[in-house]
Interface confidence: low
């Protein structure tokens, strides 16, 4: 239950009043408004939307709403020199070309400034050569090709299907394999759910639909030219050769109609197993090159995109706290889209807009939250989380001293089956308690709580009677707050049934067909799932900003630390001889986790008993809770990833979207049997265990009695 600050508010201004003010019809109206034209980062249209949101947030009643601008590196296709891929014959003649744009959806034929499909930040180039099919281009796919099948990608153009991992990891893997170009495509196996029609008659991807997206490997750096510092008016910018995370080979995305034309001619090796076959009527041969009759034909890429320093605009709204104005709870989501942004991001932006409106309504009636709430409409998320990262870099000193929590608000839906939550363990109890108080929108769960439907449909793999809550990875704007600054973070959205729908993301992700109509016709006609997500996100913000004692439970961190220590130990124990030879011990880590568990338990007991009317003691206890997440930050960062500083969680080195626990140890152990110098490699494992054990112990001590 919510425990509200009792001093300056009337009883009606509680969580219920805030939640009751949220309306599905408003979210629908806002979504429509935000999706009628494209809002690509760096364009005039997106600047105008920023100013509109600034104006409306002021009308809603926020204390101040400012634009924060930065000049960052973005990437655009050349309007007069389009990108495409061709098959060329032995004379160099182009006998097949991929399409230059997606066929526009009904009603949008005359919309201008629809950016054609492209891979943002691809270098220019016109490589030609034989094709190699590399499945999803994951680390394990290249291991299979190079180690088992002895297939050499050096000097080849590789074609990879989207899905399973972040596209930037695919490109990095292809580069390391020596490829000279990458073609990304959407296979129906991953982006066409059986029994559903393609858009505009259903929510599946048509053959001409293409997924846009950036292909950077920023590792949390933000603007590639100003890593670590804001891209402001007096910024020193790196040269393009020194820019962080840019790909070195041309990359281009295509749809499955065009992919069919490339894949149907493939020769060489057969696919190693059925997991390499998609749903197209092609053999899925690996190559290299085309089969007999077509063996003299090659693939040629024509990429002419340019990287340009461009101004972007965040909208930052403030609702000042009445009691602790120097404590910030942040709700942020991005505004920029690849095209119309029907789901990504505007289904999230519409929810944020309605949450701001509800808070504003309460404020106009004389209420204020205990702590300050900051609302953010981020720019250039699609180009590498740039808006949020630059703002956090500019305000890092304030945030690390005052940041209580960050709640992310990108796409509200990726399906309509059940809730999906990723968050710090500190927020587990907050999420559980909140969802027990909310009504489920699901059919068959009328009158039941959201917690009940969520637990039934997405049970925890470890704890019966509880729902699954996942680790935070990256690929969204919470990254800088959680992974770099150590601010407790969480995200929530409605998702699909992962058991029955094995496709990656939702089929129309980052395509021109991600429209208002997609949401209104096929995903959420009543906007009841959007409303539920608004209640979860808004409810979390309300509690974090208003509860007298911060709604963080440090005991839940103790539980997961033990689980993660057990997991990494079992990975290491796959090499028992080496562990013995090199005297690798996890005793220090397990000891630190044990100490953390005991200290967290004692802290929780004191938290129940202390005098909450004493503002000094209250502030002291809350600060211990607020700074616990910060205590997991290593100022030196992870090896070769200085902006990923959280010792317990980091984005996987093999998939930016996924979270990895004890990432330093995990990466040191990964593929250790292939390392040049085993003693050096196992020495790094030991060093990482030492770093992890020290960090857990140090974090535990922040929860000890202060004197």
């Amino acid at each position: 239950k919510s425990s509200n600050e009792a001093t300056n508010i009337t009883p009606k201004h509680n969580m219920k009043a805030f939640l009751d003010e949220l309306k599905a019809e408003n979210i629908k109206k806002f979504l429509y408004n935000f999706t009628q034209i494209p809002h690509l980062a760096g364009t005039e249209q997106n600047f105008q939307l920023a100013k509109q949101i600034q104006s409306q947030w002021k009308e809603f009643g926020l204390d101040s709403v400012e634009l924060a601008h930065y000049d960052v590196l973005l990437s655009y296709p050349n309007k007069t020199h389009p990108n495409y891929i061709s098959i060329i014959n032995e004379d160099g003649n182009e006998i097949f070309n991929t399409s230059l744009f997606e066929p526009p959806p009904p009603g949008y034929e005359n919309v201008s400034d629809i950016v054609p499909p492209f891979s943002a930040f691809s270098p220019q180039g016109m490589p030609e050569g034989d094709l190699v099919y590399v499945n999803y281009a994951r680390t394990e796919d290249f291991f299979k090709l190079e180690r088992d099948m002895k297939i050499n990608c050096s000097g080849k153009i590789v074609i990879a299907r989207y899905g399973k991992v972040f596209r930037g990891n695919k490109v990095k893997n292809a580069q390391l394999a020596g490829a000279k170009g990458v073609i990304l495509y959407s296979d129906p196996a991953d982006y066409f759910a059986p029994g559903v029609k393609s858009y505009p008659d259903g929510w599946n991807l048509p053959g001409g639909g293409v997924q846009r997206g950036n292909i950077l490997n920023l590792n949390g750096a933000g603007d590639p030219l100003t890593p670590g510092y804001p891209a402001n008016e007096y910024a020193y910018r790196r040269g393009i050769a020194e820019a962080v995370g840019l790909p070195s080979i041309p990359v281009h995305p295509i749809g499955y109609y065009d992919a069919q034309k490339l894949l149907e001619k493939m020769g060489g090796s057969a696919p190693p197993d059925s997991s390499w076959r998609g749903s197209l009527k092609v053999p899925y041969n690996v190559g290299p090159g085309f089969t007999g009759n077509f063996s003299t034909q090659k693939v040629k890429m024509h990429i002419h995109s340019t990287n340009e320093v461009t101004r972007i605009y965040n909208v930052i709204g403030t609702l000042r706290g009445a009691v602790e104005p120097d404590r910030y709870v942040i709700l942020g989501g991005h505004r920029d889209s690849w095209v119309f942004g029907g789901i990504d991001p505007q289904s999230g932006a519409a929810v944020v807009h309605e949450i701001v409106r509800s808070f504003g309504t309460l404020k106009k009636e004389g209420w204020r939250p205990r702590r300050t709430i900051l609302f953010a409409s981020w720019d250039a998320e699609e180009f590498g989380l740039l808006g949020s990262t630059e703002w956090a870099e500019e305000n890092s000193r304030l945030l690390q001293e005052r940041g209580v929590a960050y709640i992310n608000a990108d796409s509200s839906i990726e399906g309509n089956y059940t809730l999906r939550v990723d968050c710090t363990p500190l927020m587990y109890s907050l999420v559980h308690n909140l969802t027990k108080e909310l009504k489920s929108p699901d059919e068959g769960f009328e009158g039941k709580s959201l917690y009940e439907s969520w637990t039934k449909k997405s049970p925890s793999p470890e704890f019966s009677g509880m729902p699954r809550i996942s680790k935070l990875g990256s690929g969204n704007d919470f990254e800088v707050f959680f992974q770099r600054l150590g601010i407790a973070s969480g995200r929530a959205r409605y998702t699909k049934n992962w058991e029955t729908n094995k496709f990656s993301g939702y089929p129309l992700y980052h395509s021109v067909y991600e429209t208002y109509e997609l949401v209104e016709k096929f995903y959420d006609p009543m906007f009841k799932y959007h409303l539920t997500v608004a209640q979860v996100r808004g409810g979390m913000v309300f509690e974090l900003a208003n509860s007298i004692v911060l709604p963080f439970d440090c005991r839940d961190y103790a539980v997961v630390l033990r689980k993660y220590a057990d997991k990494i130990y079992s990975i290491s124990m796959k090499h028992p001889q080496e562990m013995k030879t090199y005297s690798v011990s996890f005793d220090s880590l397990f000891s630190a986790v044990k100490n953390f568990t005991e200290i967290a338990s004692k802290f929780s007991e004191r938290l129940q008993d202390f005098d909450k009317s004493n503002p000094i003691v209250l502030r002291m206890m809350n600060d211990q809770l607020m700074f616990l997440e910060r205590a997991f930050i290593d100022p030196l960062g992870l090896p070769d990833r200085p902006f990923y500083r959280h010792v317990i969680y980091a984005p996987s080195s093999h998939n930016k979207y996924a979270g990895e626990s004890f990432p330093g140890i995990y990466d040191a152990l990964f593929d250790i049997e292939s390392k040049v110098d085993p003693s050096k490699a196992w020495g790094e494992v030991k060093r990482q265990i030492y770093v992890a054990a020290f960090t857990v112990q140090a974090a535990a001590e922040t929860l000890s009695e202060v004197a």
């Epitope: 190079e146 180690r147 990608c153 390391l176 049997e673 040049v676 110098d677 085993p678 003693s679």
Partner: antibody, heavy 120, light 107 residues
């Protein structure tokens, strides 16, 4: 088919320098650790140096540390060994070698070798 | 550095003989032990890696065993093309080191 072609060997005076090159083809060069191994006339094999696929890690035998530098240009699929302050005992056939994946840091492909003679 | 001692330094054998070469490490190297064959004027060729794993394309008459400090290369039935010098090598820690070699000659 993996091919490793060394070049740059020859006669050099003590204290002189030489740069060996190894052009690699037939495999994904960037993925593999590469090494130099030498063999003095009528003697056994001696490991000299190794470099990881990205070029980020380099390793040297004590006998050449501070005098020899291993490097690679992944864009050219070429391995190098810069040899300075050469001594008579550095006289040997120098082999370029590709390290196999998996345990053992074994060498699964060798070049034909290039002879370096250090003599006044 | 880890010293690798091979024995014998040379041996004479006939076609069809079973031949065993041993290699001892000065400290434990787990199973990070590789065997090579070298013929005069040629580059070495990998036979066995990881103490006992046969490199692809190498005849099955070659086998390897051992772990820790003591290792063995066995040729079950010596063939005319097997007369050569054999080297062991540890890949356990840098610097990698080779044994002194075993020359297998025709009796």
């Amino acid at each position: 088919e993996v091919q490793l072609l060394e070049s740059g060997g020859g006669l050099v005076q003590p204290g002189g320098s030489l740069r060996l090159s190894c052009a690699a083809s037939g495999f994904t060069f960037t993925t593999y650790t590469m090494s130099w191994v030498r063999q003095a006339p009528g003697k056994g094999l001696e490991w000299v140096s190794a470099i990881s696929g990205s070029g980020g890690n380099t390793f040297y035998a004590d006998s050449v540390k501070g005098r020899f530098t291993i490097s690679r240009d992944n864009s050219k699929n070429t391995l190098y060994l810069q040899m300075n302050s050469l001594r008579a005992e550095d006289t040997a056939v120098y082999y370029c070698a590709k390290i196999k994946y998996g345990s053992g840091s074994s060498i699964d492909s060798w070049g034909q070798g290039t002879l370096v003679t250090v003599s006044s | 550095d880890i010293q690798m001692t091979q024995s014998p330094s040379s041996l004479s054998a006939s076609v069809g003989d079973r031949v065993t070469i041993t290699c001892r490490a000065s400290e434990s190297i787990n199973r990070y032990l590789n065997w090579y064959q070298q013929k005069p004027g040629k580059a070495p060729k990998l036979l066995i890696y990881g103490a006992s794993r046969l490199e692809s394309g190498v005849p099955s008459r070659f086998s390897g065993s051992g772990s820790g400090t003591d290792f063995t290369l066995t040729i079950s039935s010596l063939q005319p093309e097997d007369f050569a010098t054999y080297y062991c090598q540890q890949g356990y820690s840098v610097p990698w080191t080779f044994g002194g070699g075993t020359k297998v000659e025709i009796k």
